[in-house]
């Protein structure tokens, strides 16, 4: 089936915004009023995965952008990037492990787990304006639960 | 050599669990996922859930509230049990494995175990 | 859910006949549509994924065709051993459906 995807923005749960640092990197930084416009809006595509009763396989790629977040090893270590692809072939309902989140709702709060590296989840530090990151823990300093919210396409 | 094996009482009374393990060799319960389908007798196939390499499980919803499936790796083990058995639920059960093949054939199910009869009477 | 319709529930045929057998998913499916045979009192087997791919093993006179909603499985000439019943199964997306199964038959 053609790939089903809808536009969204996303806040951590301390309400933190999410916007572009350069060409290749998100941060997380607190935004109000006008500046909310800076923030940026992700085409969440539903795609094939290793699905679930309680996960929901997405890959998250930047509203009329070539750039999709992605999860490789970077120095042995599990790594968040922003990877450029080719416009033609994406989105696609079977999109390479690399780009699949597993999008895990619990107390009206989402995670995004890394399908390539399990139980590893896109993070944002208490600090004001650092990257977003791969976490490898859940529940201590980093912040993994995001609010969604819904943009009319 | 892929093989898959499905072992259970083939008897089971009505309003008991009716519990089956898969054991498998060839391949590793880590890597791939592993699906129970079942077919009532001189019926068709229907799928009942499955089982991922993460552990991570989905079950197919009419029977999602009686159901847990299950896997121990190490034994290459995978179990499923289903609660509150009526007569409708007599049939032949069977395993098999993933494809797993991500980015392009995921969801399929390529080798399967011969399957075990159950039937659920008193 | 996806609902899949084969047809025809029953068929039977000669050996050295052609047959086809079809499946109509109820949304878009691609090409995620596989094709099982299965005789009595065994398992079944995958002999073809991904619409037309046949599966390693498999004999040249099966073939698959379909993109989307409709599918077509094909036995170019029938041989003793291919009188068994075949089912289709979606693999898009879960739950997985299977079609009804149709049962071919020595004529």
């Known amino acids: 089936a053609p790939v089903r995807s809808l536009n969204c923005t996303l806040r951590d749960s301390q309400q933190k915004s999410l916007v572009m640092s350069g060409p290749y990197e998100l941060k997380a930084l607190h935004l109000q009023g006008q500046d909310m416009e800076q923030q940026v809006v992700f085409s969440m595509s539903f795609v094939q995965g290793e699905e679930s009763n309680d996960k929901i396989p997405v890959a998250l790629g930047l509203k009329e952008k070539n750039l999709y977040l992605s999860c490789v090893l970077k120095d042995d270590k599990p790594t968040l990037q922003l990877e450029s692809v080719d416009p033609k072939n994406y989105p696609k309902k079977k999109m390479e492990k690399r780009f699949v989140f597993n999008k895990i709702e619990i107390n009206n709060k989402l995670e995004f787990e890394s399908a390539q590296f399990p139980n590893w989840y896109i993070s944002t530090s208490q600090a004001e304006n650092m990257p977003v990151f791969l976490g490898g823990t859940k529940g201590g300093q980093d912040i993994t639960d995001f609010t969604m919210q819904f943009v009319s396409s | 050599e892929v093989q898959l094996q499905e072992s259970g009482p083939g008897l089971v009374k009505p309003s008991e669990t009716l519990s089956l393990t898969c054991t498998v060799s060839?391949?590793?319960?880590?890597?791939?996922?592993v699906s129970w389908i079942r077919q009532p007798p001189g019926k068709g196939l229907e799928w009942i859930g499955l089982?991922?390499?993460?552990?991570?499980?989905y079950y197919n919803s009419p029977l999602k509230s009686r159901l847990t499936i299950s896997k121990d790796t190490s034994k290459s083990q995978v179990s499923l049990k289903l609660s509150s058995v009526t007569a409708a639920d007599t049939a032949v059960y069977y395993c098999a494995k993933q494809t797993n093949l991500w980015a392009y054939d995921l969801y399929s199910m390529d080798y399967w175990g011969q399957g075990t009869l159950v039937t659920v009477s008193s | 859910d996806i609902q899949m319709t084969q047809s025809p529930s029953s068929l039977s045929a000669s050996v050295g006949d052609r047959v086809t057998i079809t499946c109509q998913a109820s949304?878009?499916?691609?090409?995620?549509l596989n094709w099982y045979q299965q005789k009595p009192g065994k398992a079944p087997k995958l002999l073809i994924s991904?619409?037309?791919i046949l599966r390693p093993g498999v004999p040249s006179r099966f073939s698959g065709s379909g993109s989307g909603t409709d599918f077509t499985f094909t036995i170019s000439s029938l041989q003793p051993e291919d009188f068994a019943t075949y089912y289709c199964l979606q693999s898009d997306s879960f739950p997985l459906t299977f079609g009804q199964g149709t049962k071919l038959e020595i004529k």
């Open positions: 949304q878009d499916i691609d090409d995620d």
């Open positions: 089982i991922w390499g993460s552990g991570d499980t």
């Open positions: 991904l619409a037309s």
């Open positions: 060839g391949f590793s319960l880590s890597d791939y996922g």
